[in-house]
C-alpha cells in the first residue's frame, strides 16, 4: 500500500505536471502592451503549481512540451466597439530570455469581443511568457472571461 | 513484465485520468437555460470515463485540476442572426453543490455563430457542471459543432 | 535511483504521450480542400512525437483518446472580407481509413478571420486526420496564427 502511494507521487515529482491558471491583475501603462497576471487560491480559482510569476509574467520552471491556453474578453465591448477600435490583437510569446523571444499564438478581435485559443509548444526552464494586448480597449477582469494558463504535457 | 503492466495501470486507476466528451442531447424548457448532454459509444464518439451524467449535467467523481472545454454552434445562424439576437451568451459553471456555485467560463456570441474555449480549474468529487445558454437562439446538435468535455490533469 | 529513473520512463514508453504540433505547409489545388501540414524542429516550434505525416496529413500511431486542437487564421482578412467570402468553413475529421471517415470538429468563420477550437476524441492507430478549408480565402502561414495538433490523453 505504501509502495503504491510512492508510485502515485512519481508523475508529480519526477515527471512534472507543472500547471498554472492565472487571472488578470492589470494592464500595463500606455506604452507597455503586456497584461499582468496573478494567481493563487486566495484570489479564487487561479493557481501555480511549478511555474512562477515574475512581475506579473509567467516564468516556466521545467523543460517540456506545454499546452498554453488563453481567453481574453474586452471590457465594455460590442461588435460595433470592437470594429471601431480595430485592430485589437492579442499575442502570447516568449519574451525572455531575449535569445528565445518568439510569438507563439496571435489572434485579432475583428468584430468579436472575446478571443480564445490554445496550442502545444516546447518551453524551457527560465522562459517567460508575455501576453501583449495591442489597441485602446481594455480587458475584462472577470475571472470567467479572461484567463491564461499552461499545462506541462510531456518532456 | 507483470510488474511493468501493474505500474502501467497506476495512472488510470490510482491517479485518475478521468475524462469525458459529451454531445448535446437537448435544450431545457424556456425558463431553464441549461443545455442537456449525453455521452456513450452507442451515440457516436462521446464517452464518460469516470465522470457521470446526472439528468444531462456532468458530475465529477475525482478531485483534481481539470481542463474543461466547450464548443457551441448556434443552429440556423448567420452573423446577421447572431447580432440581431444579441446577447446570446454561454456560461459553464459549477451549479451544485450550491455552496460551490461559480461561473468558470463565459463567452458571448456577438456577431459569431460559434464559441469555443477551454480552461484549467480545480474541481471536487460531487461538483456538477452546468452549461447555460441564454438568448433565443438554439444550439446545433451536430456532434462536430457542439460538444463539451473535461479532462483530469493532476491532483 | 536507477529504479526511479526506470519508472519515470514508463508513461512515455508504455503509456504513450504521443503528441504533435504542426504548422501549415501549403493548401491543395482548387478541388482539394485539404490543408497540408509540416512539422519538425528544423521548421521552428513544430514537432511530431509518435504520430507521423503522410503527404501532409497527420497519421495516428497509438490507440487512445486524444485532445485535437486547431487554429486557422485567414490571410489578408478583415471582417468585411470574411463576410463577403462567406461561407468559409474549417472541418477536422478522420479521412482514412474510409470505413472510419467522420467529421470531428467544424467551424465557420462568419465575420471573423480566425477560428480556434479543441476537442477530445477516440483515435485508432492508422487513423489519418484531414483539415478541410472550404471557401475562396487562403490561410495565413504564420506559425503563430495557423497550427494544428494532437495530444494523447489516455488509452
Amino acid at each position: 500500500q505504501r509502495f503504491a502511494q510512492a508510485q502515485q507521487q512519481l508523475p508529480l515529482e519526477s515527471l512534472g505536471w507543472d500547471v498554472a491558471e492565472l487571472q488578470l491583475n492589470h494592464t500595463g501603462p500606455q506604452q507597455d502592451p503586456r497584461l499582468y497576471w496573478q494567481g493563487g487560491p486566495a484570489l479564487g480559482r487561479s493557481f501555480l503549481h511549478g511555474p512562477e510569476l515574475d512581475k506579473g509574467q509567467l516564468r516556466i520552471h521545467r523543460d517540456g512540451i506545454y499546452m498554453v491556453h488563453i481567453q481574453v474578453t474586452l471590457a465594455i465591448c460590442s461588435s460595433t466597439t470592437a470594429s471601431r477600435h480595430h485592430p485589437t490583437t492579442l499575442a502570447v510569446g516568449i519574451c525572455s530570455p531575449a535569445s528565445r523571444s518568439i510569438s507563439l499564438l496571435r489572434l485579432s478581435f475583428h468584430q468579436g469581443c472575446t478571443i480564445a485559443s490554445q496550442r502545444l509548444t516546447p518551453l524551457a526552464r527560465g522562459d517567460t511568457l508575455c501576453t501583449n494586448l495591442t489597441g485602446t480597449l481594455l480587458p475584462s477582469r472577470n475571472t470567467d472571461e479572461t484567463f491564461f494558463g499552461v499545462q506541462w504535457v510531456r518532456p | 513484465q507483470r510488474f511493468a503492466q501493474a505500474q502501467q495501470q497506476l495512472p488510470l486507476e490510482s491517479l485518475g485520468w478521468d475524462v469525458a466528451e459529451l454531445q448535446l442531447n437537448h435544450t431545457g424548457p424556456q425558463q431553464d437555460p441549461r443545455l442537456y448532454w449525453q455521452g456513450g459509444p452507442a451515440l457516436g464518439r462521446s464517452f464518460l470515463h469516470g465522470p457521470e451524467l446526472d439528468k444531462g449535467q456532468l458530475r465529477i467523481h475525482r478531485d483534481g485540476i481539470y481542463m474543461v472545454h466547450i464548443q457551441v454552434t448556434l443552429a440556423i445562424c448567420s452573423s446577421t442572426t447572431a447580432s440581431r439576437h444579441h446577447p446570446t451568451t454561454l456560461a459553464v459553471g459549477i451549479c451544485s453543490p450550491a455552496s460551490r456555485s461559480i461561473s468558470l467560463l463565459r463567452l458571448s456570441f456577438h456577431q459569431g455563430c460559434t464559441i469555443a474555449s477551454q480552461r484549467l480549474t480545480p474541481l471536487a468529487r460531487g461538483d456538477t457542471l452546468c452549461t447555460n445558454l441564454t438568448g433565443t437562439l438554439l444550439p446545433s446538435r451536430n456532434t462536430d459543432e457542439t460538444f463539451f468535455g473535461v479532462q483530469w490533469v493532476r491532483p | 535511483q536507477r529504479f526511479a529513473q526506470a519508472q519515470q520512463q514508463l508513461p512515455l514508453e508504455s503509456l504513450g504521450w504521443d503528441v504533435a504540433e504542426l504548422q501549415l505547409n501549403h493548401t491543395g489545388p482548387q478541388q482539394d480542400p485539404r490543408l497540408y501540414w509540416q512539422g519538425g524542429p528544423a521548421l521552428g516550434r513544430s514537432f511530431l512525437h509518435g504520430p507521423e505525416l503522410d503527404k501532409g496529413q497527420l497519421r495516428i500511431h497509438r490507440d487512445g483518446i486524444y485532445m485535437v486542437h486547431i487554429q486557422v487564421t485567414l490571410a489578408i482578412c478583415s471582417s468585411t472580407t470574411a463576410s463577403r467570402h462567406h461561407p468559409t468553413t474549417l472541418a477536422v475529421g478522420i479521412c482514412s481509413p474510409a470505413s472510419r471517415s467522420i467529421s470531428l470538429l467544424r467551424l465557420s468563420f462568419h465575420q471573423g478571420c480566425t477560428i480556434a477550437s479543441q476537442r477530445l476524441t477516440p483515435l485508432a492507430r492508422g487513423d489519418t486526420l484531414c483539415t478541410n478549408l472550404t471557401g475562396t480565402l487562403l490561410p495565413s502561414r504564420n506559425t503563430d496564427e495557423t497550427f494544428f495538433g494532437v495530444q494523447w490523453v489516455r488509452p
Epitope: 506604452q31 471590457a75 466597439t81 485602446t136 481594455l138 477582469r141 | - | -
Partner: antibody, heavy 119, light 107 residues
Framework: QIQLVQSGSELKKPGASVKVSCKAS????????MNWVRQAPGQGLEWMGW????????TYADGFTGRFVFSLDTSASTAYLQISSLKAEDTAVYFC????????????WGQGTLVTVSS | DIQMTQSPSSLSASVGDRVTITCQAS??????LNWYQQKPGKAPKLLIY???RLHAGVPSRFSGSGSGTDYTFTISSLQPEDIATYFC?????????FGQGTKLEIK
C-alpha cells in the same frame, strides 16, 4: 524622484499660438506615454489625448484635433503642447500627466500651465 | 463617449463626518474607475484606482467601492486637510472622461 515640470503661465491674444512644455525627470522618458489634460477656470478636467514618447505618435480626443499638436524632444525628455489660432475658450490650465503601472491611471502630474487668451 | 455623472456637485461636512460621493457612468466600465483629489491651484492627486485600490501613501480613511455603472468614494472620518475638489475618472476606454467634480467644504 519622478517629476514633471511645466513651463510658466502665458498671456496670449486671440489668433496667436502658444507652446507649453513639460520636462520629465527621474525616469526613462521614452518608456511612458505623456497625456495632456485641460481644466477651464472653475471647471472639470478634460482629457485632450496623449503622445507615444517612443514612436512620437499622437492620439487626440474629439474636440482637440486641428489646432492642437503634441510633440516631443526626446533628447531633452520634454513633451510639448502647441495650440494655434487661440480663442478665448482656450483659456485654461493645461496639465501633463503620466501613468505608472496601470493603464489610464495618472500617478504623476505636472504643476499645470495657465494659458490666458484675451484681447 | 462614456459620460461620468458625479454627485453632489458640492457638499459641506464637519470634521469627523463620514462623507460619500457617487459617480455614475453612462455604461458599464468594468471597475476601471479612479478617484483624484485636487486642491486649489494644484494638480490633481491620485487617491484610488481600479474602484477600490488605495494609491501608495494615501490615508486609509479614503476608500472606494462599486461595480457596473455605479461607484462610490468615501472618507470615513473627514479631516481638515481633506478640503478639496474630488474627481472620478473612467479608465476603460478612450477618450478618458472625468466627472464634473465634487467640491468638499468644512461646515
Amino acid at each position: 524622484q519622478i517629476q514633471l515640470v511645466q513651463s510658466g503661465s502665458e498671456l496670449k491674444k486671440p489668433g496667436a499660438s502658444v507652446k507649453v512644455s513639460c520636462k520629465a525627470s527621474g525616469y526613462t522618458f521614452t518608456n511612458y506615454g505623456m497625456n495632456w489634460v485641460r481644466q477651464a477656470p472653475g471647471q472639470g478636467l478634460e482629457w485632450m489625448g496623449w503622445i507615444n514618447t517612443y514612436t512620437g505618435e499622437p492620439t487626440y480626443a474629439d474636440g482637440f484635433t486641428g489646432r492642437f499638436v503634441f510633440s516631443l524632444d526626446t533628447s531633452a525628455s520634454t513633451a510639448y503642447l502647441q495650440i494655434s489660432s487661440l480663442k478665448a475658450e482656450d483659456t485654461a490650465v493645461y496639465f501633463c500627466a503620466r501613468e505608472e503601472d496601470y493603464r489610464y491611471v495618472f500617478n504623476y502630474w505636472g504643476q499645470g500651465t495657465l494659458v490666458t487668451v484675451s484681447s | 463617449d462614456i459620460q461620468m455623472t458625479q454627485s453632489p456637485s458640492s457638499l459641506s461636512a464637519s470634521v469627523g463626518d463620514r462623507v460619500t460621493i457617487t459617480c455614475q457612468a453612462s455604461q458599464d466600465i468594468s471597475n476601471y474607475l479612479n478617484w483624484y483629489q485636487q486642491k486649489p491651484g494644484k494638480a490633481p492627486k491620485l487617491l484610488i484606482y481600479d474602484t477600490s485600490r488605495l494609491h501608495a501613501g494615501v490615508p486609509s480613511r479614503f476608500s472606494g467601492s462599486g461595480s457596473g455603472t455605479d461607484y462610490t468614494f468615501t472618507i470615513s472620518s473627514l479631516q481638515p486637510e481633506d478640503i478639496a475638489t474630488y474627481f472620478c475618472q473612467q479608465g476603460v476606454t478612450l477618450p478618458l472622461t472625468f466627472g464634473q467634480g465634487t467640491k468638499l467644504e468644512i461646515k
